[in-house]
Interface confidence: medium
């Protein structure tokens, strides 16, 4: 079996110019392509992988929401030579998320990593964005986490930072087929420079206080202390799955056999994000571009 091969990390890795083909190992009988797109209120980007796969032919589309961070995943496996070029992996511009200017800043600022490399998303070096409330959702928390896509024996990962609806989430995550978006939230401007080591204690959960042993001559303290030892588990309702994006049509025939122009975009939306002018077009970044299978 021969499959297309490429890796895209919010760049042009799968653009029309950069396409490669690979011969699969004996016993491998499916080609795979997977795309994961992440949207924050300040932009969007995508990860994508094409290559030799494993498992059965088929499609799996999923939409996810993590405290206002949206993720859209499409996984497609097929059993014909070079059949894994059906999903449109075009990276599109990181446009502002719709009518951004129509919303007044709510006073919170967060570091924003949308399609940035891990090097560019270190500490306080990423750009700072002003959070705003959209569609009756309050974005007053800051998020620091990662998105990971695994397919064709390849794992690609990028950092994600931005404004979210929760200020206290700790190591929360949502998963889809070969896809994970996870991280932590915090309260206060620019608090998301590094939340990798955030513990489960937050202003909502009084910390466990160790009191000195009472001295025989004094009255025991009457301070109320919460001694819960297990970390609270956030209810799953906060990470609700979203409707699956519309299904992808197969590659166009004859005239468009050598064209990607009319392949539909990965689409989807979620409550609170309809205002975004680009919410129905994925992947998004400037990416890449169609990615670059460097065309000739």
């Amino acid at each position: 079996l021969e499959c297309y091969s490429c890796v895209q990390k919010a760049d042009d890795g799968c653009s029309p110019n950069k396409m490669k083909t690979v011969k699969c190992a004996p016993g491998v009988d499916v080609c795979t392509e997977a795309v994961g797109a992440v949207e924050t209120i300040h932009g969007q980007f995508s990860l994508a992988v094409r290559g030799c796969g494993s498992g059965l032919p088929g499609k799996n589309d999923r939409g996810l929401d993590l405290h206002g961070l949206l993720a859209f995943i499409q996984l497609q496996q097929c059993a014909q030579d070079r059949c894994n070029a059906k999903l449109n992996l075009t990276s599109r511009a990181l446009d502002p998320a719709g009518n951004e200017s129509a919303y007044p800043p709510n006073g919170v600022e967060c570091y924003s990593c949308v399609g940035l490399s891990r090097e560019a998303c270190q500490g306080t070096s990423p750009p700072v964005v002003s959070c705003y409330n959209a569609s009756d959702h309050v974005y007053k928390g800051c998020f620091d986490g990662n998105v990971t896509l695994t397919a064709a024996n390849v794992t690609v990962s990028l950092p994600v930072r931005g404004c979210v609806q929760d200020e206290f989430c700790t190591r929360d995550g949502v998963t889809g087929p070969g896809f994970t978006l996870s991280g932590s939230c915090c309260q206060g401007s620019r608090c998301n420079s590094d939340l990798r080591n955030k513990t489960y204690f937050s202003p909502r959960i009084p910390p466990l206080v160790r009191l000195p042993p009472p001295e025989p001559t004094t009255v025991a303290s009457t301070t109320s202390v919460t001694t819960s030892t297990s970390a609270p588990v956030r209810p799953t309702s906060t990470t609700k799955p979203m409707p699956a994006p519309t299904s992808q049509t197969p590659r166009q025939g004859v005239e468009h056999e050598a064209s990607r122009d009319e392949e539909p975009r990965l689409t989807g939306g979620a409550a609170g994000h309809q205002d975004r002018s680009n919410s129905g077009q994925y992947p998004a970044k400037g990416g890449p571009q169609q990615p670059h299978n460097k065309g000739c």
């Epitope: 029309p16 599109r92 468009h256 400037g286 890449p288 571009q289």
Partner: antibody, heavy 117, light 111 residues
């Protein structure tokens, strides 16, 4: 039917500027990567520049980097190539081409740019 | 000097089979990038003939075929016809140059 129509070529002096246009029709222009490819008289093909569907990513051959700028107006279905600091070696027929499934699958008829004093 | 190397000329008689080679390197064809072939008839714009190593766009006769192996590729034309007289170019992406590269072109003459 897919059509690409270049315009804007002509005679220009060394150091001068020229702006080429490529009007596209018959396909969803805003979804297509586009390129400029040139061919000097009696010579082979040379890729010049390409641009992503949204216009956010641009790439250039080393020979034109810093002098040429590719851009697009998706609302007008038009691709542009702004050429500055032109040199004699930039003399060529400039073709606008659509990038399809990994290849330049549609080409315009070309427009001739002559750089001479 | 082109990044991809093609013979400057080739010839054949009607009905014959002709092969045009295209030699690259580890930064282009050898890196796994797909190879394309273009036909340029005299006085006209290039036309996509073969894409993706061996795929024919609709309208291209099956007399034209492409193949790729290692760092090189080839275009075969069987049942040569007079209207096949043209310049043929191979192309592929090049990692080092971060862009598409073309061969120098092969002028095919039908004797």
């Amino acid at each position: 039917e897919v059509q690409l129509l270049e315009s804007g070529g002509g005679l220009v002096q060394p150091g001068g500027s020229l702006r080429l246009s490529c009007a596209a029709s018959g396909f969803t222009f805003s979804s297509a990567w586009m390129s400029w490819v040139r061919q000097a008289p009696g010579k082979g093909l040379e890729w010049v520049s390409y641009i992503s569907s949204s216009g956010s990513s641009t790439y250039y051959a080393d020979s034109v980097k810093g002098r040429f700028t590719i851009s697009r107006d998706n609302s007008k279905n038009t691709l542009y190539l702004q050429m500055n600091s032109l040199r004699a070696e930039d003399t060529a027929v400039y073709y606008c081409a659509r990038e399809g499934l990994w290849a330049f699958d549609k080409w315009g008829q070309g427009t001739l740019v002559t750089v001479s004093s | 000097q082109s990044v991809l190397t093609q013979p400057p000329s080739a010839s054949g008689t009607p009905g014959q089979r002709v092969t045009i080679s295209c030699s690259g390197s580890s930064s282009n064809i050898g890196a796994g990038y797909v190879v394309h072939w273009y036909q340029q008839l005299p006085g006209t714009a290039p036309k996509l003939l073969i894409y993706d190593n061996n795929q024919r766009p609709s309208g291209v006769p099956d007399r034209f075929s492409g193949s790729k192996s290692g760092t090189s590729a080839s275009l075969a034309i069987s049942g040569l016809r007079s209207e096949d007289e043209a310049d043929y170019y191979c192309a592929a992406f090049d990692d080092r140059l971060s862009g598409p590269v073309f061969g120098g072109g092969t002028k095919l003459t039908v004797l």
